[in-house]
């Protein structure tokens, strides 16, 4: 394991009043090599709803780096390379679990958190609202 | 907190050989607003690369239910509703963290695991391999 200095301001796991706290082993199963989605496929470039990947970095969170997709266009790319604004590029979102250091900077103490990330984009037919 | 009897077969958090282990407060914090945007879009139906959601259930994992996207077609749906096989519907994958009890039934001990899930589908231009 890694030797971690005890920070006096950090919670003590033996403290009976500490909220429902458990030990979590971070030796992750299934450590897939690539964490950068650009390496695993080039769909972000070849899609009719292409997206850019933005690095969201937070040292107080595990994983500290998360890639967020931002659709490049409002519309979708046609075969000729032009954008069709009768269609919409939209982000596909996924709720994921992360660990956040709490209190901040305490190396050994985290809180489970759910966050919403945009994974990629898809091309959809718009919803047309007809005014009466 | 909840009083939990120590199970003799469960790891001891003070054990120096216990793999990189941290304390985690499991009162899940949800960074999203009260309504859950991950659940509220019907893109899976409106996309040019529509998908079905299949239940992946594992009672020994949190979350116990994860939804896997399976693209409905090999090709992409055109404006007239027909499938264009010159384009490809492909799954967008995301690596997510889940919690697993380890050893099983030890109330205070978990292991973090990475799994790869298909979140939705996008329509891409195929890679054409020209034979010399």
């Amino acid at each position: 394991g890694i030797a971690i200095p005890r920070n006096s301001g950090c919670p003590n796991s033996e403290d009976k009043n500490f909220p429902r706290t458990v030990m979590v082993n971070l030796n992750i199963h299934n450590r897939n090599t690539s964490t950068n989605p650009k390496r695993s496929s080039d769909y972000y470039n070849r899609s009719t709803s292409p997206w850019n990947l933005h690095r969201n970095e937070d040292p107080e969170r595990y994983p500290s780096v998360i890639w967020e997709a931002k659709c490049r266009h409002l519309g979708c790319v046609k075969a000729d390379g032009n954008v069709d604004y009768h269609m919409n590029s939209v982000p596909i979102q996924q709720e994921i679990l992360v660990l956040r250091r709490e209190p901040r900077h305490c190396p050994n103490s985290f809180r489970l958190e759910k966050i919403l990330v945009s994974v990629g984009c898809t091309c959809v037919t718009p919803i047309v609202h007809h005014v009466a | 907190g909840i009083a939990i009897p120590r199970n003799s077969g469960c790891p001891n958090s003070e054990d120096k050989n216990f793999p990189r282990t941290v304390m985690v407060n499991l009162n899940i914090h949800n960074r999203n607003t009260s309504t859950n945007p991950k659940r509220s879009s019907d893109y899976y139906n409106r996309s040019t690369s529509p998908w079905n959601l299949h239940r992946n259930e594992d009672p020994e994992r949190y979350p116990s239910v994860i939804w896997e996207a399976k693209c409905r077609h090999l090709g992409c749906v055109k404006a007239d509703g027909n499938v264009d096989y010159h384009m490809n519907s492909v799954p967008i994958q995301q690596e997510i963290l889940v919690l697993r009890r380890e050893p099983r039934h030890c109330p205070n001990s978990f292991r973090l695991e990475k799994i790869l899930v298909s979140v939705g589908c996008t329509c891409v231009t195929p890679i054409v391999h020209h034979v010399a």
Partner: antibody
Framework: QVQLVQSGAEVKKPGSSVKVSCKAS????????ISWVRQAPGQGLEWMGS????????NYAQKFQGRVTITADESTSTAYMELSSLRSEDTAVYYC??????????WGQGTLVTVSS | DIQMTQSPSSVSASVGDRVTITCRAS??????LNWYQQKPGKAPKLLIY???SLQSGVPSRFSGSGSGTDFTLTISSLQPEDFATYYC????????FGQGTKVEIK
Amino acid sequence: QVQLVQSGAEVKKPGSSVKVSCKASGGTFSSYAISWVRQAPGQGLEWMGSIIPWFGTTNYAQKFQGRVTITADESTSTAYMELSSLRSEDTAVYYCARDSEYYFDHWGQGTLVTVSS
Amino acid sequence: DIQMTQSPSSVSASVGDRVTITCRASQGISNWLNWYQQKPGKAPKLLIYAASSLQSGVPSRFSGSGSGTDFTLTISSLQPEDFATYYCQQYSDDPTFGQGTKVEIK
């Protein structure tokens, strides 16, 4: 096969509290939540709140916030729902249900709570 | 809260009939809609989850469809054991149920 077995019927006075139990037999709670849903006589179903026994995390419907407490004891695979400051409108059948956070797939048999002076 | 409105509130039908119950959500809920069957004095039973997926052990005469705000439960050929009350329920947000539809013998 998961079975949820609830405690027996209760008769309570207005202003008092009731605590209903729900025991998971044929397996542990696993990682699912346990939700509590009530049904007043001749009425529809109303979700009250839930707990994830693995974590102790609770989520309550706004209507019951401050009046309901949901707990779980993993060592006995039992969840509890305590409702305080009872009034006659709380007369209902109270159900526990296994909650995948998407649907309720296993239900207890129900516990009738009658609030009467 | 998301409001769920079922129609009709009751329906009289005969064995062998095709019965359709509709459920409307006050806002879009994607496909996060479930259908339950409840018989008098019994707990509800999950029939359909995620709008159209049949729960294991449920007869195939039950089917669900819809997305967004409008959903339908169909019983293709009503059987004697199907006379019951049916509830829709959303899980896009904190769960809420429709008011129920009672399927009665004609």
